[in-house]
Amino acid sequence: GITNINCSGHIWVEPATIFKMGMNISIYCQAAIKNCQPRKLHFYKNGIKERFQITRINKTTARLWYKNFLEPHASMYCTAECPKHFQETLICGKDISSGYPPDIPDEVTCVIYEYSGNMTCTWNAGKLTYIDTKYVVHVKSLETEEEQQYLTSSYINISTDSLQGGKKYLVWVQAANALGMEESKQLQIHLDDIVIPSAAVISRAETINATVPKTIIYWDSQTTIEKVSCEMRYKATTNQTWNVKEFDTNFTYVQQSEFYLEPNIKYVFQVRCQETGKRYWQPWSSLFFHKTPETVPQVTSKAFQHDTWNSGLTVASISTGHLTSDNRGDIG
């Protein structure tokens, strides 16, 4: 960077190299060049010469003044015009940054995605700070009172193996940067209460031609949690409003749920689950589309989410795509 150049003098910033965005700042340049009494001192910002608000303080020093500085980062350097020198002589350079102190972190949330082996803690960091901001996540056992700290620049994954102090913890987050420090409220957690079951997916739909046509949705999860509550929402793609069906589910088996839908309409389905009685839900699963037949029954499944075909007795939809472990979305 610009800070690594060999200097023939000194450049400094008041009030500081990192300052609050929108402040008035002064950049000073002092020459110390052998056999040179500078005729003129020049300032450059990001390689472009500044023309205004430059004041000569004395023979070797000048000041550049900025009002309401709003750039997050800038590279500054200054040069001198020396007699008998054809080119300007570089004096020194400095990278400057402007931003904001951190907001108080809020909405601290910790969850354990089943099979992940981690407790994932997230929070709302508030407004963008524009400058390097670090977060320290404090995890304190309510049983042993032992406290662990984890440094991060965003969220944190804490191995559940490292949580040796029982099941109950306090979690809070400190945010800090060059302009300030803030601390969140404390969140009390019990490890058994924050598990989110392995993602549920809709794999297939089929409409069976009966006196009243009926659509069967096949859906599944790899969870081994015994008591799981799920919601399946569905609507015609032309509608704004979702219908929601609730299920108490045991994923020992693949689930099959029946719906009585209007004929010749394209529907969209999603599912999400939580451990029964617990706080956090999975994100909604990816959209699953199924068009009900006019008269001929229909099957839709994961591999054919863009095509619908007739199979004689039934017409089905099969959903496409693989689950990814980071397909998590909202958890509230």
């Epitope: 599944d220 795509g321 689950l323």
Partner: nanobody, 128 residues
């Protein structure tokens, strides 16, 4: 009742490829949780080769076949495939297809006792 029929076995030179198929009948494919491929060499225990979670296509492999074998499914044909590339003499075995009706912890996919239904097997022989 549930029936699994393997095909595609045979003899091949080391470095060659084979594609095994397992076609299921007697049930709706989508009601199975997992399908897996196992193998048993003479005098050895049956070992898990690969498995697939039917609902979303998540796949699992034994370390010894990772990067060489690929398991896939075709729900429209009620079929699971095992594409075997870069075959080695140590891949010689009787290959079985299996289906699991009930859920289990995914990391235990390779345990034969997790599976309820089995095919008769198809022989794969790799010569050096």
């Amino acid at each position: 009742q549930v029936q699994l029929q393997e095909s595609g076995g045979g003899s091949v030179q080391a470095g060659g490829s084979l594609r095994l198929s397992c076609t299921a009948s007697g049930y709706t494919f989508s009601t199975m949780k997992y399908m897996g491929w196992f193998r048993q060499a003479p005098g050895k225990e049956r070992e898990g080769v690969a498995a697939i979670w039917i609902a979303a296509g998540n796949t699992y492999y034994a370390d010894s076949v990772k990067g060489r074998f690929t398991i896939s499914q075709d729900n429209t044909k009620n079929t699971v495939y095992l594409q075997m590339n870069s075959l080695k003499p140590e891949d010689t075995a009787l290959y079985y297809c299996a289906a699991a009706r009930y859920g289990f912890v995914p990391s235990t996919w390779y345990l034969p006792e997790r599976y309820n239904y089995w095919g008769q097997g198809t022989q794969v022989t790799v010569s050096s």
